[in-house]
């Protein structure tokens, strides 16, 4: 039988006008090494920024060797969507697929890739390419993790106390301070899967005049600083 688990890949695309494209293809070496080791099926997580384009690719198996190509897409709160192409009849079929932004890149007999145009939070989910050959199935499970950049704000709300917020990020951002203070951190979870992180810090030591809030996130890091004034100061705001 064929070794199953041959790697789903994600394709690097060039920037498309103003819309960036996610670099989602696995490195060839990594894929083929995985293949040659005949691993059990691996579920790979892959982060992709929201509002980018993504192209998901199947293993490198020529059409002449295939019977059926199927994309299985499981999104949270929705029935499983399948897009299938049967070579013998040159027929494509879709079941429970409602998101018009998830499509074949072109005709499946020319290209088995799947594209997601303008990735949204709702595209978080499990994608799998299944290539059916006469000797078995080649497939790879794949978890798409959509990343949302938080908006970062820093302000002083009372004497020698500063508040740093990373609003509506996905996943939750991590906040740290320089110098360290007496801090309390809270997380607020939103229904769309984003998280707001709020860190409030107080500095008793009077020789601390400037403090820096450092926000770490998968989409990038951001640092903001503020001077500790005797009265609440100006608000600072920035996107990562």
């Amino acid at each position: 039988a064929a070794q199953p688990n041959n790697s789903l890949m994600l394709q690097t695309s060039k920037e498309n006008h103003a819309l960036a494209s996610s670099s989602l293809c696995m490195d060839e070496k990594q894929i083929t090494q995985n293949y040659s080791k005949v691993l059990a099926e691996v579920n790979t997580s892959w982060p992709v920024k929201m509002a980018t384009n993504a192209v998901l690719c199947c293993p490198p198996i020529a059409l002449r060797n295939l019977i059926i190509i199927t994309w299985e897409i499981i999104l949270r709160g929705q029935p499983s969507c399948t897009k299938a192409y049967k070579k013998e009849t040159n027929e494509t079929k879709e079941t429970n697929c409602t998101d018009e932004r998830i499509t074949w890149v072109s005709r499946p007999d020319q290209n088995s890739d799947l594209q997601i145009r303008t990735v949204a939070i709702t595209h978080d989910g499990y994608y799998r390419c299944i290539m059916v050959t006469p000797d078995g199935n080649f497939h790879r499970g794949y978890h798409l993790q959509v990343l949302v950049t938080p908006e970062v704000t820093l302000f002083q709300n009372r004497n020698r106390t500063a508040v740093c917020k990373a609003v509506a990020g996905k996943p939750a951002a991590h906040i740290s301070w320089i110098p360290e203070g007496d801090c309390a951190t809270k997380q607020e979870y939103w229904s769309n899967g984003t998280v707001t992180v709020k860190s409030t810090c107080h500095w008793e030591v009077h020789n601390v005049s400037t403090v820096t809030c450092h926000v770490s996130h998968l989409t990038g890091n951001k640092s903001l600083y503020i001077e500790l004034l005797p009265v609440p100061g100006a608000k600072k705001s920035a996107k990562l």
Epitope: N6, M9, C25, E28, K29, T32, R64, N65, T133
Partner: antibody
Framework: QVQLVQSGAEVKKPGASVKVSCKAS????????MHWVRQAPGQGLEWMGY????????NYNEKFKGRVTMTRDTSTSTVYMELSSLRSEDTAVYYC????????????WGQGTLVTVSS | DIVLTQSPASLAVSPGQRATITCRAS??????????MHWYQQKPGQPPKLLIY???NLESGVPARFSGSGSGTDFTLTINPVEANDTANYYC????????FGQGTKVEIK
């Protein structure tokens, strides 16, 4: 283990036909595409075409269309390559090669069959 | 059809040195993140033997002295260090569409 065993050397006259066989063993015969390649003396490799034993699908190099026919016999796990209207420039070693799924690479080859076309 | 052009046509290398063969395709043989370019070694009286597949992946059992690189239209096979028994003809082959071979490179060991 996978083995591809080809038929023996042939000597043919110009205008005649030759049928070379390639017997497969060690795997499920109908599962893998088989290619045919030839190599004239002192020359490089030339792809002739392939047959998919699973569905009898064939695809030939444009250069050989009309002269080449590839067939298979699933009962004996054998593929055949027949070349007609032979000319002296068809003198070559003919190889069968099995295509592996991943990357469409050719991991297994027959030992080769020398076909000599001479009057 | 995609035409593959190999260079040089022949190459003489001393043992322990590096041998580099290039293969240029008339159009890209890469798609979906993969480059459908393979390299074969053929010794006199023998069928070709697969060395490298998908441009850069070493076939099982092939010494790590052999390596491949490239994408799109330009590819390279490197033998480093060369050994005496590497005397052979080397062919690039693509399987992006209908398969074709390069014209071959003869490698001789000085």
């Amino acid at each position: 283990q996978v083995q591809l065993v080809q038929s023996g050397a042939e000597v043919k006259k110009p205008g005649a036909s030759v049928k070379v066989s390639c017997k497969a063993s060690g795997y499920t015969f109908t599962s893998y595409v088989m290619h045919w390649v030839r190599q004239a003396p002192g020359q490089g490799l030339e792809w002739m075409g392939y047959i998919n034993p699973y569905n009898d699908d064939t695809n030939y190099n444009e250069k050989f269309k009309g002269r080449v026919t590839m067939t298979r016999d699933t009962s004996t796990s054998t593929v055949y390559m027949e070349l007609s209207s032979l000319r002296s420039e068809d003198t070559a070693v003919y190889y069968c090669a099995r295509e592996d799924y991943y990357g469409s690479r050719w991991g297994y080859w027959g030992q080769g069959t020398l076909v000599t076309v001479s009057s | 059809d995609i035409v593959l052009t190999q260079s040089p046509a022949s190459l003489a290398v001393s043992p322990g040195q590096r041998a580099t063969i290039t293969c240029r395709a008339s159009k890209s043989v890469s798609t979906s993140g993969y480059s459908y370019m393979h390299w074969y070694q053929q010794k006199p009286g023998q069928p070709p033997k697969l060395l490298i597949y998908l441009a850069s992946n070493l076939e099982s059992g092939v010494p790590a002295r052999f390596s491949g690189s490239g994408s799109g239209t330009d590819f390279t096979l490197t033998i480093n260090p060369v050994e005496a028994n590497d005397t052979a003809n080397y062919y690039c082959q693509h399987s992006r569409e209908l398969d074709t071979f390069g014209q071959g490179t003869k490698v001789e060991i000085k």
